[in-house]
C-alpha cells in the first residue's frame, strides 16, 4: 500500500459527499493534490482540489451529486487515491478501499430551535440533514450546554440512544442565558464518528416571577 | 500492440535546429505521457524531459531547458521534440518513450526505435 | 540531481553461471509516497531499451524469471540467475523517485 509517512482519512455523509484530510510528513513543495475516487460499480468518478488546512496536511470534498441524493450502497467500495503531480504526471501518494457505509460521519445537525422555554427547562428541536434513508431509526445523538462561566469542553455530556429530534433540559438556572449544542452519528459502520457539533443555539431562561417560581 | 515509430536519421550544422518526431500506434495517444531520452555515442542514456498529449503540458529537465520544444498533433497520434542551438555535444540517438499519465510503478514501458542525430560542421 | 552509479562496467560472464549488477544511489530514493521507484533496463545491441524490473523487484511483463532485482534506500542489485546468449547487452538502473530522473552509466554483459 502506498502510505510512506502519510495519513488519508475520509468520512462518507450517508448520501452524496466523501470529505478527505490527507496529512503529510515533510513540507511537498508548490504542487497540485487531488482526490480520485473510482467506485467498484459504478459509472461515474470524481476528484476534488486537496487545499491546505494546515502546514502538512490538506483537504477537500468530493461531491457525488444532489445533496440528498443516494450516491452510495452499503455494497459499494470505493477505490480513493491522492495524486499529486510530478512534472505532467499524477503520483500516487496515497490510496485506500473506502467502504463508505463502514466510515460514517453525517452532517451536524441543523435548524435547532427553541420550541418552549420555563424558568428551570427549556425544550429544543433539531433536524438532521442529509442523512440516509436506510439508517431508519438506527442513530444516536450527543448534547451539551455551556453555562455562564464554563467552556464548551467543561459541559456534561448528554446522550440520547434512539433517534430523537428534540430535548428537554432541565434544572436550569433562571434568566440566564445559555447555549446548546447537539451532534448524531450512525449505529452502523466500523470507522463511524460523530457529526461535527451543530452551530450553537443561544437561548436564555425566563426570569423567576415575584413571589413564586414556575 | 503498442508501437512507436521515430523519424529518419538527421545531420545538422552547430547552431542549428533538430525536430524528431514519433508516431504512436496501438493505443489511445492522449491517454499516456511520451518521454524523451537520448543517448550519446557509447554513452548512457539521458531523461530530457516530457508531455502529456492529452493537454499538451510539458516538463523538461532542467538541462535542457530554453533549447528543448515538445510538441504533439493529436490527429495523427505524433509527438515532436524540437533541440535548438545544436552543439557537437548533441550528437546521439534520442528515444522517445511511453508512459503511464499515473505514474504508479514504471516510468517508461514502450520505446520508440530511436533516431540518430548527427551535429557535425 | 541523484547521481546513480553502477558496477561493474563490464562483466564478463559464463553461459548458465549467474551475474550480479550493482547500482548505487547518491541519495535516499524512496519516494514520500513509501515507494522506491528503481526500474531497470535491458539494451540489447543495436536495439532500444526495454524495461525488465519497476519498483526494485517487479518484473514487466513478459521478462524471464531469471531476471531478478532488489534492494534498498541508496543500494540495489540486478541478477541473472543463469545467463543465456541473449542477455548480452548493456544494462541501465533508473531512479523515478526524483525529479529529473536519472541512469545509471549502464554495465555491460558480455559472454566469456
Known amino acids: 500500500a502506498v502510505n510512506g509517512t502519510s495519513q488519508f482519512t475520509c468520512f462518507y455523509n450517508s448520501r452524496a459527499n466523501i470529505s478527505c484530510v490527507w496529512s503529510q510528513d515533510g513540507a511537498l513543495q508548490d504542487t497540485s493534490c487531488q482526490v480520485h475516487a473510482w467506485p467498484d460499480r459504478r459509472r461515474w468518478n470524481q476528484t476534488c482540489e486537496l487545499l491546505p488546512v494546515s502546514q502538512a496536511s490538506w483537504a477537500c470534498n468530493l461531491i457525488l451529486g444532489a445533496p440528498d441524493s443516494q450516491k452510495l450502497t452499503t455494497v459499494d467500495i470505493v477505490t480513493l487515491r491522492v495524486l499529486c503531480r510530478e512534472g505532467v504526471r499524477w503520483r500516487v501518494m496515497a490510496i485506500q478501499d473506502f467502504k463508505p457505509f463502514e466510515n460514517l460521519r453525517l452532517m451536524a445537525p441543523i435548524s435547532l430551535q427553541v420550541v418552549h422555554v420555563e424558568t428551570h427547562r427549556c425544550n429544543i428541536s433539531w433536524e438532521i440533514s442529509q442523512a440516509s434513508h436506510y439508517f431508519e431509526r438506527h442513530l444516536e445523538f450527543e448534547a451539551r450546554t455551556l453555562s455562564p462561566g464554563h467552556t464548551w469542553e467543561e459541559a456534561p455530556l448528554l446522550t440520547l440512544k434512539q433517534k430523537q429530534e428534540w430535548i428537554c433540559l432541565e434544572t436550569l438556572t433562571p434568566d440566564t442565558q445559555y447555549e446548546f449544542q447537539v451532534r448524531v452519528k450512525p449505529l452502523q459502520g466500523e470507522f463511524t464518528t460523530w457529526s461535527p457539533w451543530s452551530q450553537p443555539l443561544a437561548f436564555r431562561t425566563k426570569p423567576a416571577a415575584l413571589g413564586k417560581d414556575t | 500492440e503498442v508501437q512507436l515509430v521515430q523519424s529518419g536519421a538527421e545531420v545538422k550544422k552547430p547552431g542549428a535546429s533538430v525536430k524528431v518526431s514519433c508516431k504512436a500506434s496501438?493505443?489511445?495517444?492522449?491517454?499516456?505521457?511520451i518521454s524523451w531520452v537520448r543517448q550519446a555515442t557509447g554513452q548512457g542514456l539521458e531523461w530530457m524531459g516530457e508531455?502529456?498529449?492529452?493537454?499538451?503540458?510539458?516538463y523538461y529537465n532542467e538541462m535542457f531547458k530554453g533549447r528543448v520544444t515538445m510538441t504533439r498533433d493529436t490527429s495523427i497520434s505524433t509527438a515532436y521534440m524540437e533541440l535548438s542551438s545544436l552543439r557537437s555535444e548533441d550528437t546521439a540517438v534520442y528515444y522517445c518513450?511511453?508512459?503511464?499519465?499515473?505514474?504508479?510503478?514504471?516510468?517508461?514501458?514502450?520505446w520508440g526505435q530511436g533516431t540518430t542525430v548527427t551535429v557535425s560542421s | 540531481d541523484v547521481v546513480m552509479t553502477q558496477s561493474p562496467l563490464s562483466l564478463p560472464v559464463t553461459l548458465g553461471q549467474p551475474a550480479s549488477i550493482s547500482c548505487r544511489s547518491s541519495?535516499?530514493?524512496?519516494?514520500?509516497?513509501?515507494?522506491?521507484?528503481l526500474e531497470w533496463f535491458q539494451q540489447r545491441p543495436g536495439q532500444s531499451p526495454r524495461l525488465l524490473i519497476y519498483?526494485?523487484?517487479n518484473r514487466f511483463s513478459g521478462v524471464p524469471d531469471r531476471f531478478s532485482g532488489s534492494g534498498s534506500g541508496t543500494d540495489f542489485t540486478l541478477k541473472i540467475s543463469r545467463v543465456e546468449a541473449e542477455d548480452v547487452g548493456v544494462y541501465y538502473c533508473?531512479?523515478?523517485?526524483?525529479?529529473?530522473?536519472?541512469f545509471g552509466g549502464g554495465t555491460k554483459v558480455e559472454i566469456k
Open positions: 518513450a511511453r508512459g503511464s499519465y499515473t505514474y504508479d510503478n514504471y516510468a517508461m514501458d514502450f
Open positions: 496501438g493505443y489511445t495517444f492522449t491517454d499516456y505521457v
Open positions: 508531455i502529456y498529449p492529452g493537454d499538451a503540458n510539458t
Open positions: 541519495q535516499n530514493i524512496v519516494h514520500s509516497n513509501g515507494n522506491t521507484y
Open positions: 519498483k526494485v523487484s
Open positions: 533508473f531512479q523515478g523517485s526524483h525529479i529529473p530522473w536519472t
